[in-house]
């Protein structure tokens, strides 16, 4: 079983644990080329990559963020684009320039005394996708800097659910914890029968939904206790 | 800004102690698994140990089980590696490494030597 | 363990011209949660990794884009559309599916 394998730390045996790393997985684990290691680096130009495609804000410029170029347009092709001034519309606090952040879909002052109190439960690390997004300098750091993300998206790392955006939970992902999906009617889920009766849970399922609860699939009564599907199924 | 740093490398005699830290920095470090990872002189790299998130659960490869203690600090950000019965073999650079969003350090110097 | 096997070992390029690199792994490095969990790293001499591509063929940040990373399964290609003398060094595939974490066994690029 995968209990007596960790137990007897037997490594080989299991299951993924990136990194990773990268972590992540990482998910394993690292920086990319010239940015983890500030100095006389070919890969810390950028200048000469323009427009800059990137997969998330913290890869873009202070005064960028990321998106598709065109409203629509296809996810996977992203650039660094410039950032929204006051007033403009916005989605996400990294869209407004620095000094401002999203409130209501528009770019706001953050120089507000109720901004930190307004927004402060929804900082997490909501980088989205599993790589380094070291730039070299520091980022999102003050509150003049875009420190304030929204909830975390799925694959961001989180410490508890609530850390999360809706309909997503944080679970266990190799050695990490991560923003995963609320499960849905028909999934598969994970039924503690006692709590400590389980061995370590590398790849954590969230719990089922809500109106729904984790219970054996019904034409798997006759199949044998080990092997007991369970699904998430209305109450 | 996000970075892991190495300390505690040096030059210390076969079967003596050294504590190795990794200070991380820029990211929610309690919310990563962490690892060790090293490499030895004109040589490949090599994995040494894991720890999860919260610190309960770790792992090591067999050429160090028994000697080396991987540890984390999630209150001070930093990560640990206590090795013990140091041997010639572990003679190495070596990096602290974030999971899932790939991280690492730029390694410290462990030369053990008589 | 997964034995990860890079071809060639050794690789010399006339600046302007391609490269590729291969690497192999022992089982699959598709994780069941949609990724594959292959890296590509440039190590220089006295130098840190410096990772270059991750989850087979995402590009880290601030990396050029004439580096790009392919394959699926097994079988994996970092490939350098147009080498450049800051590109030598020892390129080496990384994969973090399976503790422990498993290395090629590196391919030094050389200028001609």
């Known amino acids: 079983t995968l209990n007596s394998v960790l137990n007897s730390n037997a490594i080989k045996n299991l299951p993924p644990p990136l990194g990773g790393a990268a972590g992540h997985p990482g998910s394993a684990v690292s920086a990319a080329p010239g940015i983890l290691y500030p100095g006389g680096n070919k890969y810390q130009t950028i200048d000469n990559y323009q427009p800059y495609p990137c997969a998330e804000d913290e890869e873009c410029g202070t005064d960028e963020y990321c998106a598709s170029p065109t409203r629509g347009g296809d996810a996977g092709v992203q650039i660094c684009l410039a950032c929204r001034k006051r007033r403009k519309r916005c989605m996400r606090h990294a869209m407004c320039c620095p000094g401002n952040y999203c409130k209501n879909g528009i770019c706001v002052s953050s120089d507000q005394n109720n901004f930190r109190g307004e927004i402060e439960e929804t900082i997490t690390e909501s980088f989205g996708n599993d790589h380094s997004t070291l730039d070299g300098y520091s980022r999102r750091t003050t509150l003049s800097s875009k420190m304030y993300h929204s909830k975390g998206q799925e694959g961001s790392v989180c410490l508890r659910s609530s850390d999360c955006a809706t309909g997503l939970c944080c679970a266990r992902h190799f050695w990490s914890k991560i923003c995963k999906p609320v499960l849905k009617e028909g999934q598969v889920c994970t039924k503690h029968r006692r709590k400590g009766s389980h061995g370590l849970e590398i790849f954590q399922r969230c719990y089922c939904g809500e109106g729904l609860s984790c219970r054996i699939q019904k034409d798997h009564h006759q199949a044998s206790n080990s092997s007991r599907l369970h699904t998430c199924q209305r109450h | 800004q996000v970075q892991l740093v190495e300390s505690g490398g040096g030059v210390v005699q076969p079967g003596r102690s050294l504590r190795l830290s990794c200070a991380a920095s820029?990211?929610?470090?309690?919310?990563?698994?962490m690892h060790w990872v090293r490499q030895a002189p004109g040589k490949g790299l090599e994995w040494v140990a894991v720890i999860s998130y919260d610190g309960n659960d770790k792992y090591y490869a067999d050429s160090v089980k028994g000697r080396f203690t991987i540890s984390r600090d999630n209150a001070k950000n930093t990560l640990y590696l206590q090795m013990n019965s140091l041997r010639a073999e572990d003679t190495a650079v070596y990096y602290c490494?974030?999971?899932?969003?790939?991280?690492w350090g730029q390694g410290t110097l462990v030369t053990v030597s008589s | 363990d997964i034995v990860m096997t890079q071809t060639p070992l050794s690789l010399s390029v006339t600046p302007g011209q391609p490269a590729s690199i291969s690497c192999k792994s022992g089982q699959s490095l598709l994780h069941s949660d949609g990724k594959t969990y292959l890296y590509w790293y440039l190590q220089k001499p006295g130098q840190p990794p410096q990772f270059l591509i991750y989850e087979v063929s995402n590009r880290f940040s601030r990396v050029p884009d004439r580096f790009s990373g392919s394959g699926s399964g097994t079988d994996f290609t970092l490939r350098i559309s147009r080498v450049e003398a800051e590109d030598v060094g020892i390129y080496y595939c990384m994969q973090s599916i399976q503790l422990p974490w498993t290395f090629g066994q590196g391919t030094q690029v050389e200028i001609k």
């Open positions: 490494a974030r999971e899932l969003r790939v991280l």
């Open positions: 820029g990211f929610t470090f309690s919310g990563y698994g």
